[in-house]
């Protein structure tokens, strides 16, 4: 595949990653699966340069990000690590709450209204991030 | 402006069934969870149901659960209430409501008129 | 289930007066998203309910600023600055922190 060097229309550059921001809800499978479809994942977050960036753009909305425990450890969907990587959970976060009457606990991360990131029910549709790396190889044929 | 039109509602005998339809316009009908709520004459709010905006999930009250099926037609922006194995409690107006926004929000900013629905032999 | 508890059940007041309303919840309404799912409803005779405040203290588009949401975890209360004629309904407190989502009783206010 081609190298991609600029970002897709309707999507934004930062520190050689693009981002785009949906503007209405899925659950976080659908999300994911929304991100995959565009050769990319959802967001994974990685510094508190890269959170602040994310949440200038999202605004005080829950979002989804790559992250989720759904077989057990907390895993980010690109394969970085979570026990040495960034982290920005609220207070007495993540906390798998069972008491939401969704049945099961709590098993993806999204972004709160103050950035800070909560554990919650997978199936609740809540805007998501989608990302790519700029300078890895696309899925795209090279144009001939 | 967003408009949710309940039909379908009307007198039924206990032990029969019934189907409400809810018609939407003037906003985008598939992006959107909807809920049923009902009261009973002379009585509070009851919340009864939930679907996602795409029909994936759908949640009930427990006084209805097994008897209740809501479900939607994304293509003909209309959301439904089958409700079978009537009885005399389940006489009430029922409303149809819309999330407010179209992702998760957790309250209803729109609702239609009501369909009365009455439940006697 | 959430049990949702208003009081007073109903009230009567004086046109410029102002008026109070307690909701209380059997568990606390904070989500660990920080918001609190507590919601405030008026039902006008005759008319389906239309929500007054989102959030504990959010007031909805077009709701006049006399009207105010307070509270947090389990305690909260509607105020009206100065009520007016067309405040008379019922007044229901909602939660949504918990399926199934319930209601408080209503609260009757009245013009004397």
């Known amino acids: 595949g081609s190298e991609r060097t600029c970002c897709p229309v309707n999507w934004v550059e930062h520190e050689r990653s693009c981002y785009w921001f949906s503007r209405s809800g899925k659950a976080w499978a659908d999300a994911d699966n929304y991100c995959r479809l565009e050769d990319a994942h959802l967001v994974v977050v990685t510094s508190w340069e890269e959170q602040k960036f994310v949440q200038h753009h999202i605004g005080p909305v829950n979002t989804w990000m790559g992250l989720h425990d759904q077989n057990g450890p907390w895993k980010w969907v690109d394969g970085t690590d979570y026990e040495t990587g960034f982290k920005n959970w609220r207070p007495e976060q993540p906390d798998d709450w069972y008491g939401h009457g969704l049945g099961g606990g709590e098993d993806c991360a999204h972004f709160t209204d103050d950035g800070r990131w909560n554990d919650d029910v997978c199936q609740r549709p809540y805007r998501w991030v989608c990302e790519t790396e700029l300078d890895k190889a696309s899925q795209e044929p090279p144009l001939l | 402006q967003v408009q949710l039109v309940e039909s379908g509602g009307g007198v039924v005998q206990p032990g029969r069934s019934l189907r409400l339809s809810c018609a939407a316009s003037?906003?985008?009908?598939?992006?959107?969870?909807m809920h049923w709520v009902r009261q009973a004459p002379g009585k509070g709010l009851e919340w009864v149901a939930i679907?996602?905006?795409?029909?994936?999930?759908?949640y009930y009250a427990d006084s209805v659960k097994g008897r209740f099926t809501i479900s939607r037609d994304n293509s003909k922006n209309t959301l439904y209430l089958q409700m079978s194995s009537l009885r005399a409690e389940d006489t009430a107006v029922y409303y149809c409501?819309?999330?407010?926004?179209?992702?998760?929000?957790?309250?209803?900013?729109?609702w239609g008129q009501g369909a009365l629905v009455t439940v006697s032999s | 289930d959430i049990v949702m508890t208003q009081t007073p059940l109903s009230l009567s007041v004086t046109p410029g007066q102002p008026a109070s309303i307690s909701c209380k919840s059997s568990?606390?309404?904070?989500?660990?998203?920080?918001?609190?799912?507590l919601y405030w409803y008026l039902q006008k005779p005759g008319q389906p309910p239309q929500l007054l405040i989102y959030?504990?203290?959010n007031r909805f588009s077009g709701v006049p600023d006399r009207f105010s949401g307070s509270g947090s975890g389990t305690d909260f209360t509607l105020k009206i600055s100065r009520v007016e004629a067309e405040d008379v309904g019922i007044y229901y407190c909602?939660?949504?922190?918990?399926?199934?989502?319930?209601f408080g009783q209503g609260t009757r206010v009245e013009i004397k």
């Open positions: 409501a819309r999330d407010a926004h179209d992702f998760w929000s957790g309250y209803f900013a729109y």
């Open positions: 003037g906003f985008t009908f598939s992006s959107y969870g």
């Open positions: 679907i996602w905006y795409d029909g994936s999930y759908k």
């Open positions: 568990q606390s309404l904070l989500h660990g998203d920080g918001k609190t799912y």
């Open positions: 959030e504990v203290s």
């Open positions: 909602m939660q949504s922190i918990q399926i199934p989502w319930t």
